[in-house]
Interface confidence: low
């Protein structure tokens, strides 16, 4: 019968010929009366056999990531008779892995959006690197992730590549961050290879800013001849948020005379002061009203940012019109 051990050849061997092992028949008494032959893909070009001894050699540098095993056939012939001594046998040469591939991030570019003011621990995105080396061969393809850029706002879980928030961020101060993640194989041990990727993390807006009046005092005038419904002026608040989080509603907080109203222009986000009742200079020539402004949409959990709505005082002077 055939006698052999399992055959392994390390990939990327630079020697011109590398001894892999020996194939032999147990009928071979060592007197050179048998001839060994190698058949199959790679026989003669990649692998050769010593016809007399059955020793097998790799004569080419192999790349496991290109091909990890070779299935060959062996024959042994009695030189004197030309007949097969053993039935032809199939055997396998496995190419063993070395750490010759760095981790690669295949899904880049990475981009994620996360709400500003998200708490520590909030999951942002998972980055995944792949390593063409053999995952079953030691630590060649066992990866560890680390953060090269992005502290103190982000952290990465070393074994999963999950990026999390580690410090609260305010979109109004900075609305996007570049995070650089490194993946190292060999679980970071000496000889490790590494790859990096960049992640663009954009902060989406949350309603953490209330609208605030630009002025604490406005002065407007109204002619006593103005009809009801007349727009007598505008007031304006600003809100550091964006989109619907910056949409606001103006209203009257105090107007004992019930003479004025404020409507909101939702396109310009201005408050328009409207005359609700006609005024008479001789009866009253000035008015003081207080207006307030609030955001249109405020989730209940963000109400703490919207306590005590911003207010402003509006002084309204009535202009006299000569009466006939």
């Amino acid at each position: 019968g055939w006698v052999w051990n399992q055959f392994f050849v390390p990939e990327e061997m630079n020697t011109t010929s590398h001894h892999i092992g020996q194939l032999r028949s147990d009928l071979d008494n060592g007197n050179n009366s048998f001839q060994y032959k190698l058949l199959g893909a790679g026989a003669g070009s990649t692998f050769i056999i010593d016809e007399r001894t059955g020793d097998i050699y790799a004569i080419q540098k192999l790349d496991r990531e290109e091909r990890s095993l070779y299935i060959l056939r062996a024959q042994v012939i009695d030189i004197a008779t030309g007949r097969a001594v053993e039935p032809e046998s199939e055997f396998v040469i496995k190419v063993s892995d070395i750490n010759d591939n760095e981790p690669k991030f295949l899904d880049e570019p990475y981009e994620a959006i996360v709400p500003e003011m998200s708490p520590e621990g909030t999951l942002v995105i998972q980055v995944t690197a792949s390593d063409a080396d053999d995952p079953s061969s030691g630590n060649n393809a066992r990866l560890l992730y680390s953060l090269l850029q992005g502290q103190p706002y982000f952290s990465v879980e070393p074994t999963t590549g999950v990026i999390r928030i580690s410090s609260k961020m305010d979109r109004e101060l900075q609305d996007e961050y570049w995070v650089i993640i490194q993946a190292k194989d060999m679980i970071g041990q000496p000889g490790a290879l590494s790859g990096t990727t960049s992640v663009l993390i954009k902060l989406s807006d949350v309603n953490d800013n209330k609208p605030i009046f630009k002025e604490s005092l406005y002065r407007l005038t109204v002619s006593e001849s103005a009809p009801t419904g007349t727009s007598i002026g505008t007031i304006m608040a600003y809100d550091n948020d964006i989109g619907e989080n910056a949409e606001m509603d103006y209203s009257i907080e105090e107007d004992d005379s019930q003479t004025f109203d404020i409507i909101t222009n939702h396109e310009t986000q201005e408050g328009i002061v409207i005359l609700k009742k006609k005024v008479d200079f001789e009866h009253q020539n000035h008015y003081g009203i207080r207006a307030k402004v609030k955001n249109h949409h405020v989730p209940e959990q963000l109400m703490k940012y919207h306590t005590e709505a911003s207010t402003t005082f509006i002084k309204i002077q009535v202009e006299d019109v000569d009466e006939p």
Partner: antibody
């Protein structure tokens, strides 16, 4: 270590004033909204006031609005509660508490200072 | 304001037993913005649970929170001697209010 230490409590007559202080250490005080919470003897907890991390906004419970003023000095890592027009029902242990970075619940409390309003 | 009602007022149990504390809100607590605190005599409250069910840092896993809307529960799976204390629920979705407390005492 990370801690809050209140001081300034004592006995005061109705209508009187007191100023409580809360010294913070071991964390970035200026990054956190801070609150006062009180507990009357043998009673439950009652939220009193909040001040934003930068002092820009303050909010009070109805029971103290107009009488108490919350303030902070971020350069000295200190929170204050100025209590005027004190009433007997203000008698309580006053705790300062830190709101979490996430916001809204309290992850760090001081040991409290007792305010007794009595004639 | 949202009123929180805790029950029972007092719970008498032995070490090793399971404790179930209830907290009911007068209206729905937005997005489960509910916390639980433990307070021992002469000490400041200590955060146990936030977001109705998330354990605070350093809190043993025998403490668990559940519930949503108006009904919330704090469960202590096996009472240890150090767990006998007063427990408060707190909502933080609309201003801040606390329940009146449940005292867990040794039977």
């Amino acid at each position: 270590q990370v801690q809050l230490v209140e001081s300034g409590g004592g006995v005061v007559q109705p209508g009187g004033s007191l100023r409580l202080s809360c010294a913070a250490s071991g964390f970035s005080f200026s990054s956190y909204d801070m609150d006062w919470v009180r507990q009357a003897p043998g009673k439950g907890l009652e939220w009193v006031a909040v001040i934003w991390y930068d002092g820009s906004n303050k909010y009070y419970a109805d029971s103290v609005r107009g009488r108490f003023t919350i303030s902070r000095d971020n350069s000295k890592n200190t929170l204050f509660l100025q209590m005027n027009s004190l009433r007997v029902e203000d008698t309580a242990v006053y705790y300062c508490a830190r709101e979490t970075g996430e916001g809204w619940y309290f992850d760090l409390w001081g040991r409290g200072t007792l305010v007794t309003v009595s004639s | 304001e949202i009123v929180l009602t805790q029950s029972p007022g007092t719970l008498s149990l032995s070490p090793g037993e399971r404790a179930t504390l209830s907290c009911r809100a007068s209206q729905s607590v937005s997005s489960s913005y509910l916390a639980w605190y433990q307070q021992k005599p002469g000490q400041a409250p200590r955060l146990l649970i936030y977001g109705a069910s998330s354990r605070a840092t350093g809190i043993p896993d025998r403490f668990s929170g559940s519930g949503s809307g108006t009904d919330f529960t704090l469960t202590i799976s096996r009472l240890e001697p150090e767990d006998f204390a007063v427990y408060y629920c707190q909502q933080y979705g609309s201003s801040w209010t606390f329940g009146q407390g449940t005292k867990v005492e040794i039977k």
